[in-house]
Amino acid sequence: APFDDDDKIVGGYNCEENSVPYQVSLNSGYHFCGGSLINEQWVVSAGHCYKSRIQVRLGEHNIEVLEGNEQFINAAKIIRHPQYDRKTLNNDIMLIKLSSRAVINARVSTISLPTAPPATGTKCLISGWGNTASSGADYPDELQCLDAPVLSQAKCEASYPGKITSNMFCVGFLEGGKDSCQGDSGGPVVCNGQLQGVVSWGDGCAQKNKPGVYTKVYNYVKWIKNTIAANS
């Protein structure tokens, strides 16, 4: 493996318990994707995380243990973006309506949608229960966190020639070693208190010159608001 440190997310750290109160786990008998609570009844995730039946788990830290702060709520509606493209992963975004309202408290709360696009160099928080090994597999029980900067669109496109659309952006480190990975999909990229990204894809994980690629939430604010209004 190119990086032999005690990998978390890959190269991150154990989040402080319930310090990411908007983070949710999507469960279909097991955790398969992350998501972000954007209001009491709606979650944003990745389009490629679509399944016909999903249980949304809020207030989680250790997904293998009932710790007392969890809220398990079934999805009532699962709405993938109408222009989602499974080949290019363009428009990789999805909305989930909860069958009942989440109880908002110190350990379960919402994250704001962006008011401006992500600025190059901005430090963001990426979180999830995905693979913590850049090679092989090591799935954590506890939520992992990673602080990482937004990369310029030029560097992003240079890393993945011909594959980056205007609905995608890169976050991470070109030197490798720190990245999101399998199991983090759909999870949040939060910059300055706003949900700027959704974990989407990458070539491998934490590889040199292959940063993580994220759905640019800013481009979908209108769609999110319209969809919520039409399904309330």
Epitope: A1, P2, G29, Y30, H31, F32, C33, A46, H48, C49, E64, L89, G130, S135, G136, A137, D138, Y139, D141, K163, S180, C181, Q182, G183, D184, S185, G186, V199, S200, W201, G202, D203, G204, C205, Q207, G212
Partner: antibody
Framework: QVQLVQSGAEVKKPGASVKVSCKAS????????MHWVRQAPGQGLEWMGS????????NYAQKFQGRVTMTRDTSISTAYMELSRLRSDDTAVYYC?????????????????????WGQGTTVTVSS | EIVMTQSPATLSVSPGERATLSCRAS??????LAWYQQKPGQAPRLLIY???TRATGIPARFSGSGSGTEFTLTISSLQSEDFAVYYC??????????FGGGTKVEIK
């Protein structure tokens, strides 16, 4: 059709090396992990290691560390497993197997790994 | 290293009967578990992945269940072609990838 075709049976003397090849066809070779598994006569399956054909990065089981080398030639979609300093207890059938999880342009959903395609096996006999 | 333990080592069953094979992990592997069937002189064949998802072309009589540390492969009504050795394998934490020791399903 997706398949893995391995090289033929080998008979080696103790202390020698053996190199087994595994030619992939019907899919993008660089997109998937390739693993090597062996099975001694009458025994179970034993994982030896894997190679990422895109990067060439390898993972080896500790038991084989220092004795095994996994390589690939992307131009001919072939993976290789070389085992050195052979002993009689290395007598086994050696298999290559593909993990269907994409390495390139991979979605970061939790993957469901498995060995979906196996080579036919290569019998390696180590005898003096 | 995660140790996978299969039981029983040998299962004697009559054709048409139900067979239940067990696989236990030394620590949680979530749902990152696969089952294989191997017949003499042949390479293993993937039956189940993700603990419960049947691989392409696998008959519905094969089903997998469980998560965490306890897993089961059930063959609802054994056919003559089902007599073979079955292996479980975890993908939750590797290297190393680890297999169970196998369960031989033989004709009673």
């Amino acid at each position: 059709q997706v398949q893995l075709v391995q090289s033929g049976a080998e008979v080696k003397k103790p202390g020698a090396s053996v190199k087994v090849s595994c030619k992939a066809s019907g899919y993008t070779f660089t997109g998937y992990y390739m693993h090597w598994v062996r099975q001694a006569p009458g025994q179970g399956l034993e994982w030896m290691g894997s190679i990422n054909p895109s990067s060439g990065g390898t993972n080896y089981a500790q038991k084989f560390q220092g004795r095994v080398t996994m390589t690939r030639d992307t131009s001919i979609s072939t993976a290789y497993m070389e085992l050195s300093r052979l002993r009689s207890d290395d007598t086994a059938v050696y298999y290559c197997a593909r993990d269907p999880v994409l390495l390139l342009r991979q979605q970061r959903i939790l993957h469901e790994s498995a060995f979906d395609i196996w080579g036919q096996g290569t019998t390696v006999t180590v005898s003096s | 290293e995660i140790v996978m333990t299969q039981s029983p080592a040998t299962l004697s069953v009559s054709p048409g009967e139900r067979a239940t094979l067990s696989c236990r992990a030394s620590q949680s592997v979530g749902s990152n578990l696969a089952w294989y069937q191997q017949k003499p002189g042949q390479a293993p064949r993937l039956l189940i992945y993700g603990a419960s998802t049947r691989a392409t072309g696998i008959p519905a009589r094969f089903s997998g269940s469980g998560s965490g540390t306890e897993f089961t492969l059930t063959i609802s009504s054994l056919q003559s072609e089902d007599f073979a050795v079955y292996y479980c394998q975890q993908f939750h934490n590797w290297p190393p990838l680890t297999f169970g020791g196998g369960t031989k399903v033989e004709i009673k």
